[in-house]
Structures are given as C-alpha cells and as structure tokens.
C-alpha cells in the first residue's frame, strides 16, 4: 500500500538498517526509496528538545511485515518509501538549504558569484555530490563567496550542522542538467586498473553498468564475464573511481569488459530497470518466499508485486509435475544484487520491475516499428499528439510530443495568431483524425510558453511548451519520449523518423492517418549549402534525402523528429521549416532539441 504523507512527531521503533544525514524529511524519503532494502524511515528535525548531534538524522528501516510500531517523539518525522507506490519517482533535488552546512570531503574550493553558480559547478564536476556556499554575509571575510564541492561514499552528507549565512544543496546530475560527457562505449577485453569502491555480482556488463550509474561513487566499472578464467571472480562487477574521474590506464584481459557510469545521461536510459531474463542462470540470495508459477514471466510479476523482492530464480516444472507449474524463488540481499550467480543449473533468473518507475517513463520499450509503408499503426509513436484549434472552427493545427505528464513540446510558429490557450485542445493516443469527435476526450492547455528569443521559424528558437490543465496517465498509446542528453552531443543518430498528419505534397490537405517517414540527418555544413539565404545555426538540425521525396510538410510543424539510440527513442528535432516539401537538395530544418534541454528543464521543473 502506498503511503505518501509524512507522520509528524512519530518515530518507527526498530528495523534499523543504517543511518544517513539528510537536510529534510522529504529528502530522507527519497533516500529510503532509492536504498535497496529501506521500506520505512524516521527523520529527526532540528528542535530544542533534541540533542543537536541527532538533528537531520535519517534512519532507514526495513520490516518483514512492511510496517513497524509507532512511538510519539517530538521532532521525529516518519514515513514510508515510495517503493510501495506506482507513481514516477525522481532523485532530482533542486532545493537550497539555508543556514545548513552539509559535511563531506571538501575536495574543491573556489570563488562563486552565487549559490546557483556553485550548484552548477557541482553539477558539472564528476565527483561532486553536494556543496556548501558561504554567502557574502558570511562573518569570515576570507570565506565569503567560497563554493565548497563535496563528496562522500554514500552521496549523502556525513553530518549536517547549523551554520549562519551559508547555503547548501545537491548536484543536479539526477535532474538531467549536467554538461558532463556521456561515455556510452563498452570496452571488450579491457580492465580498468583503478580503486575499487565496491563490488557486486551482475549477470552481464549492462547490468553492471547500470549499477555503476546509480551508485553515488562509481565513475567507471570492470565486469568479469562468466567465461573469466578465475572462477571466484566470474560475474563480478567492480565499481571504480579515480582522482581524475577517468581510468588511469586500460589493461587488456580476455573475457572482461569495462565501461563508464552514465550518470550524466541517466534520464534517457534505463538505470534501475533490469528487464532481461537470464537463462540457465541461478541468482543466490536470502530467500523471501517460494511460490508456484506457470512461467518465468509470471515469476517476475510475483517478484515485482512483492515489495521486498529484489530478484528471483525460476526453476521450470518437471514434466506433468505440479500442474505444469515451476518453482519461483523470490529473493533479496543487502545491496539488491545476487550474492552469487551460478550457471548450468537450468534456472531462469531476473530482477523485480518495481524499480522501473525510478527510471524516466520515456525509456520504456514500445512495440517494434512497422517496417515499410508510410501509414503508422496504433501505439507506434505514443508521444505524438495532435494539437487542435477550435477557432474559428475545430481543425488540426500542429503536431507535438509528450515529454512529461503535463508537458507537450512543439514549435513556436504554431501559435501565430493564437490569442489564448483556451482555444487549444491536445489529443493524445490518436492514429486517425477521424477518431476525433465531439465527445473525444482531450487535454486543455493551461499555458503556452514560447521561447522569448523566437521571432520567426527561419531565424531559430522555434520551440514552445504547452502546460496541460490535467496530467496524462501513461499507457501503451500515450507516453513520453526522452529528451536527448547534453552529454550525448557527439552521438550520430542513424534511425530517425518524422511523423505527422501534415500534407503529403505542397498543395494537399491534412491526412487522416498519422504518416511516418524514415529520414537521414544531414550535417549543418551540408544544410547551409542548401540554404544560402539563411543562417543554419547549431540550434537547428537538418534531415532529408538529397534526391528529396520524403520530408515533413505543412501540418507536421511542431511534431517530432524521433531517433532511436541504444533501444531508446529520443526527441532530436521539432519540425520547423523548409523550402517547399520534399524538394531535391532542400532538407527539412528542425529545432535542435539538445540545445534547448536547459530551457525545457528550467520551464518544466520550475517550482
């Protein structure tokens, strides 16, 4: 059962796993949610009745019954982890804590103009977990405007104390705001020879990489595969760090793989969600329960529904035994990973999908693309919306993309002459325009946010956000698309599609069925040659065939240029402008979304 409210002046008795320090009860709840075993917590707020050494303590707790006895205690705030909830969870914490000094290892000290600049510095520093900034009112002259970057083993402060005229806060890496490079390369036959900060067991290098990504101190990793010669090290995932933030060297070793934490692009990759099944593989751990199940998929569902289950092993039924049901072993461990992985015993293993909600919804796999043809099928582009105007009569105005449960990203030029958001309707999960009737449900628009530097499509900044009046419930036919990572600027997208209900030729009409076209990206240099009279800036991206024939056209504006990378769809462009439609040597010009990620996050995450 999901309990979100905090219990004031209440302490949970017993069940302690560990104690950390957090600046607020709200953040204690987040820490509990991300901890592999924590189900409940008790936080101690600052209070004259409490010993100051206990202020800001966050005690993480576990219980077989998922609850603990409650005791009244002044200044104690207790609650439950969000593991029990189905809603989206984020580790992003933009709060600034006034007059609090969050203690850690001070590894970097520099002058900063403001707390915001200090936070940005922390976000763009590979080691930084949190910071403390001495304001210009700080008593000690030599410490004023000093920005201290800090890290700890856990990513949370080792202590928090009251200190006048300082502010503290956390790195915004988990808010997708870091400019650090995202090194997605996996290096086969490679060992990184640097300090191990931790080691866990993992079934493959991808799970090892994901564990590294959400481990606060891990910057890169080395994984020993099941063919590794030393039996005791098989399936071992070594989590590593170094002073420089990069491996000091690479050593060639067969059957080892190495790679990097994807911390700076984790919002557009699954990190917590290990959805694969591992055949002929047994995961060892503390046994939670043994239940009968028809299949390994059913076993995974059972694990996902049991809040304390972290992973499972399914042993298929022997012929005609137990009504064809196999045994489903639900398991857990102290760190969420198997304590040992064995091969060749016939089991099928995997992980709970409960943690998938800690990943961005946009990373969820959607149904496979339909190859060939130009008409889409239902659920093929679940982020695509049709934006209608009701004035003077109702009609399709532009396309758009769902990027959050209350946000649509589209083009600014769509709103020429639109006086009020009241005349707009957003329809999601639509394949055919003919489905839209008088009684078809839609989302009203609360606010239109146009980039303040927008003048006309051809001069750039052709981007706008629509804030919806109500939230979108994600389903197979309506879900968000990931924004590209700023750390991914060097990625070459080779699988890009433009979609919309727009014209199929210059003089035409709006199409009934959502159309799709696979279109290659064109370099900005090449694009500039095709548009001598315009300035193709780095904030634009072009796509099209040299010979023409496939392109976006009137009515597609604002819609997505969607590119698939590492099995995840990214909103690379917003259909903006072009010379005619599908003309030879006239590529379509799109708003380059990666250049506006900061702007999008600033507007959508505004408190």
């Amino acid at each position: 059962e999901c309990v979100t409210q905090l219990l004031k002046d209440t302490c949970f008795e017993g069940g302690d796993i560990t104690t950390v320090f957090t600046p607020s009860a709200k953040y204690c709840q987040v820490v509990c949610t991300y901890h592999p075993r924590c189900l409940l917590f008790t936080f101690t707020a600052e209070s004259p009745s409490e010993d100051p050494t206990r202020w800001f303590t966050c005690v993480l707790k576990d219980s077989v019954t998922e609850t603990l006895p409650r005791v009244n205690r002044t200044a104690a705030i207790s609650g439950y982890s969000f593991k029990q909830c189905s809603h989206q969870i984020s580790a992003c914490n933009k709060d600034i804590y006034v007059d609090l000094d969050m203690k850690g290892i001070n590894y970097n000290s520099s002058v900063a103009k403001s707390a915001q600049e200090c936070q940005e510095r922390c976000t763009d520093d590979v080691h930084c977990h949190f910071f403390t900034y001495a304001t210009r009112q700080f008593p000690s002259l030599e410490h004023r405007n000093i920005c201290l970057l800090k890290h700890t083993q856990t990513g949370t402060p080792t202590r928090i104390t009251k200190l006048d005229k300082v502010v503290s806060g956390f790195s915004l890496k988990s808010c997708a705001l870091s400019n650090l490079a995202c090194i997605r390369d996996i290096f086969p036959n490679t060992v990184f020879a640097d300090s191990n900060i931790d080691s866990v067991m993992a079934p493959d290098a991808f799970v090892c990489g994901r564990i590294c990504t959400h481990h606060p101190g891990c910057l890169f990793f080395t994984f020993f595969s099941q063919e590794w010669p030393k039996e005791s090290q098989r399936n071992l995932c070594l989590l590593k760090t170094s002073e420089s933030g990069l491996p000091s060297t690479r050593i060639k070793k067969s059957k080892a793989l190495s790679g990097f934490s994807l911390q700076s692009c984790r919002h557009s990759i699954p990190v917590f969600c290990h959805s694969s099944f591992y055949h002929d593989t047994d995961f060892l751990g503390e046994e939670l329960d043994i239940v009968a199940a028809k299949s390994h998929e059913a076993c995974q569902k059972l694990c996902t529904n049991a809040v304390r289950c972290q992973f499972f092993t399914y042993t298929p039924a022997q012929a005609s035994c137990n009504e064809g049901k196999g045994k489903c072993y639900l398991k857990l461990s102290s760190n969420g990973s198997p304590t040992k992985i064995l091969h060749g015993r016939g089991g099928i293993s995997g992980y709970t999908l409960r943690l998938c909600k800690m990943d961005n919804e946009c990373t969820t796999k959607i149904k496979p693309r339909i190859v060939g043809g130009t008409a889409s099928v239902r659920g093929e582009w679940p982020w695509q919306v049709t934006l209608h105007t009701t004035s003077p009569t109702q009609r399709h105005l532009c396309g758009g993309s769902i990027i959050g449960n209350q946000w649509i990203l589209t083009a600014a030029h769509c709103f020429y002459g639109v006086e009020s958001p009241k005349i707009l309707r957003v329809y999601s999960g639509i394949l055919n325009q003919s489905e839209i009737k008088e009684d078809t449900s839609f989302f009203g628009v609360q606010e239109i946010i146009i980039h303040d530097q927008y003048k006309m499509a051809e001069s750039g900044y052709d981007i706008a956000l629509l804030k919806l009046e109500t939230t979108v419930n994600y389903t197979d036919s309506q879900r968000p698309i990931c924004l590209p990572s700023k750390g991914d600027r060097n990625v070459i997208y080779t699988d890009c599609w433009v979609t919309g209900w727009g014209y199929r030729k210059l003089r035409d009409k709006i199409q009934n069925t959502l159309q799709k076209a696979k279109i290659p990206l064109v370099t900005n240099e090449e694009c500039q040659k095709r548009y001598r009279g315009h300035k193709i800036t780095h904030k634009m991206i072009c796509a099209g065939y040299r010979e023409g024939g496939k392109d976006a056209c009137k009515g597609d504006s604002g819609g997505p240029l969607s590119c698939k990378h590492n099995e995840v769809w990214h909103l690379v462009g917003i259909t903006s402008w072009g010379e005619g439609c599908a003309q030879r040597e006239r590529p379509g010009v799109y708003t380059n979304v990666v250049e506006y990620v900061d702007w999008i996050l600033e507007k959508t995450q505004a408190v």
Partner: antibody, heavy 118, light 107 residues
Framework: EVQLLESGGGLVQPGGSLRLSCAAS????????MAWVRQAPGKGLEWVSS????????LYADSVKGRFTISRDNSKNTLYLQMNSLRAEDTAVYYC???????????WGQGTLVTVSS | DIQMTQSPSSVSASVGDRVTITCRAS??????LAWYQQRPGKAPKLLIY???SLQSGVPSRFSGSGSGTDFTLTINSLQPENFATYYC?????????FGQGTRLEIK
Amino acid sequence: EVQLLESGGGLVQPGGSLRLSCAASGFTFSDYEMAWVRQAPGKGLEWVSSIVPSGGWTLYADSVKGRFTISRDNSKNTLYLQMNSLRAEDTAVYYCATWGDSWGFDFWGQGTLVTVSS
Amino acid sequence: DIQMTQSPSSVSASVGDRVTITCRASQGISSWLAWYQQRPGKAPKLLIYDASSLQSGVPSRFSGSGSGTDFTLTINSLQPENFATYYCQQADSFPIAFGQGTRLEIK
C-alpha cells in the same frame, strides 16, 4: 573500402601550433576508437594519442600530454589533433589509425609530415 | 610503462629464406602482442595480433608465437614484397609501445 586521409601538416616554428585532420570513409566512423601514431624521420613508430568512439575519453603519451589535444566530429567523420607548443622533437610523419578490439591499429592513413624548425 | 626491444635491428636474407624476428617485453604481457610491416614510404600494416592470430588478408607464410615476455615473428619462404621494416607492439596496456623495428633487407 576503409580510407583515412590526413591533412594539415607543414612547417612550423618551435612554440607554434598546428591542427591535423583525418577524414574517414568506408566504415562507420562513430563506432571506432581512433588514434594518432607518429614516426620521426628514419626512426620507429610512437603512439601519440587515442580517443574513444563517443569522444568522451582521450589518452595521451607522456611526451605530448598537456600540449596535444585529440578530438573527433562524428557528424563529419573526422579526427583531429591540435598540436600546441611544438618542439623540434615533434617533427615526424603523423598517421591516423583505427584501433580495433584486437588492440591493434587495423587501418592507417598515408600520413602527413609535420616539420618543427626555426 | 612497458618497453619493447626487438632483435636484430636488421637482418639480410634471400628470396625463399625463412626469417625469425624476436621481440622482448620489459614485463609479462600475456599474449597481447601485435606485429606490423612497413614498406619504405608507406604506412604500417597490421600482420598479427594476440601474438599468433593472423589479420585477415595476410599470407599464411607469416606466423607469430610466444607469450609472457618473449615473442617471435617468422616469415617462411620470403617473397620480394616482404623486404620491409617490421615492428612489434605491446597490446597489454596503455601507453601503447612499439619496438624500435627490424629492417629486413635483400642479401
């Protein structure tokens, strides 16, 4: 067919700068780690620098660390080497090469000569 | 850092001969060694990797052996186009290091 074409070499004074380019074709450039290897006149081969496919991690020989910068533009299929504070001992033919999973330099360009002299 | 030493620095042989070039690493490098051929005025060409694996397209008269610190490149039945300079390269760890080269000349 894999092709690597270096350019940008020439005569430069000690302390000067030069930028080498390597245009790649015939393979998926963004999937490959790339490197620069040099050869001083009449001498052996010396590895200079490497860069991973994403461009996010670079490695350098001690002899060039802090002076040379390797980079790549995957959209242009081009590898670069920015050489600053050049010294007479940097005089060499500079080759661009692909670095394979075998930990060998699979394909090489024809090289470009850099001469550092006053 | 690992250093590589090749011997001899030059060798003379005739067409049809069998030639052996050796390479020694300053520390054990398992079988992580590559061999290259460089003809005058040309770029090097990868012949062998992992001490004994032949790169595709390389004639079978080239063979490699060894592990740990001592390695050999053998060329059977020398052909005119085989007269060139040969380099070994340790592929164990960064920084990558080459041997100083062995020049194979026509006797």
